[in-house]
């Protein structure tokens, strides 16, 4: 039971067109010392959504930025949220290693569905 | 200091809908996801869902999908939970709860009065 | 969905007694639990978070213990005030399931 859990509460979340949505993720443990990534998709056309090591997200903010939540929490808001960002969103943490980082653990991943935008 | 105020108790015919609110103050309504739980007479605590205030976005618990929508209204720091096509099982006490920031893991801190929602022909 | 188990469902003690309510959840959660107090007519009250840590104002006759899946409350001397009913949360999964419920009356 120590070993790292990655937690994503929401198996499914909606929200309408032009809104934010917030996707959240927790570890249970900072052990193994590694980045953590959010994909959209599974397997080898998943799409890097934030990698928490490097890049430019310019719809993304890391949670913890505006609540400075804790260390573990690695949840994520995207704005402007459209019709296109529709699909599974999965938190994964990597182990580091040399030269590449290694996959260690995804969560069970948040299904995003998007409502129309309210009149 | 922090207060979820609902809105009074309501008697209900099977098949109709009920609307109730839970108005927010003491802190900053945005940043604070809130849940709305509910119990049947004599028994025990069931969780319905989410909202978060701040983007609107919800989850609901798979029994309650698609009779629940949970909305929001930041203006007046309002979360609202209506819930739909009424039984006789669903009369309960409804609490809106706020879920407070902590180092590991989701926590309910403050809870609503809670509101009596009677269903009966 | 995670199942939450409490147990037992009511007990009978006196003021002073120590008692001890179990929660068991039905895949481990890590430390990722809660205690709540309810009660007759009242909201239920966050007495524990994180499993062991004792919320703001609770007294510190109430503790909490566990990891994974076994979970215990422990209140180390009853007081009049302290009967009550008390679920425990999973905050890992939604739904966040509840224990049953264990009602603590006066023997």
């Known amino acids: 039971e120590d070993e790292l859990q990655v937690i994503q509460p929401e198996k499914s979340v909606s929200v309408a067109a032009g809104e934010s949505a917030t996707l959240r993720c927790a570890m249970t443990s900072l052990i193994p010392v590694g980045p953590i990534m959010w994909f959209r998709g599974a397997g080898a056309g998943r799409e890097l959504i934030y990698n928490q090591k490097e890049g430019h997200f310019p719809r993304v903010t890391t949670v913890s930025e505006l609540t400075k939540r804790n260390n573990l929490d690695f949840s994520i808001s995207i704005s402007n949220i459209t019709p296109a960002d529709a699909g599974t969103y999965y938190c994964v943490k990597f182990r580091k290693g040399s030269p590449d980082d290694v996959e260690f653990k995804s969560g069970a991943g948040t299904e995003l569905s998007v409502r129309a935008k309210p009149s | 200091q922090v207060q979820l105020v609902q809105s009074g108790a309501e008697v209900k015919k099977p098949g109709a809908s009920v609307k109730v609110s839970c108005k927010a103050s003491?802190?900053?309504?945005?940043?604070?996801?809130m849940h709305w739980v509910r119990q049947a007479p004599g028994q025990g605590l069931e969780w319905m869902g989410i909202i978060n205030p701040g983007g609107g976005s919800t989850s609901y618990a798979q029994k309650f999908q698609g009779r629940v929508t949970m909305t929001r209204d930041t203006s007046t720091s309002t979360v609202y939970m209506e819930l739909s096509s009424l039984r006789s099982e669903d009369t309960a006490v409804y609490y809106c709860?706020?879920?407070?920031?902590?180092?590991?893991?989701?926590?309910?801190?403050?809870w609503g009065q809670g509101t009596l929602v009677t269903v009966s022909s | 969905d995670i199942q939450m188990t409490q147990s037992p469902s009511s007990v009978s003690a006196s003021v002073g007694d120590r008692v001890t309510i179990t929660c068991r959840a039905s895949?481990?959660?890590?430390?990722?639990l809660a205690w709540y107090q309810q009660k007759p007519g009242k909201a239920p009250k966050l007495l524990i978070y994180?499993?062991?840590s004792l919320q703001s104002g609770v007294p510190s006759r109430f503790s909490g213990s566990g990891s994974g899946t076994d979970f215990t409350l422990t209140i180390s001397s009853l007081q009049p005030e302290d009967f009550a009913t008390y679920y425990c949360?999973?905050?890992?999964?939604?739904?966040?399931?509840f224990g049953g419920g264990t009602k603590v009356e006066i023997k």
């Open positions: 709860a706020r879920e407070g920031l902590y180092s590991s893991g989701w926590y309910i801190d403050v």
């Open positions: 003491g802190y900053t309504f945005t940043s604070y996801y």
């Open positions: 949360q999973q905050a890992v999964s939604h739904p966040f399931t």
């Open positions: 895949q481990g959660i890590s430390s990722w």
């Open positions: 994180a499993a062991s």
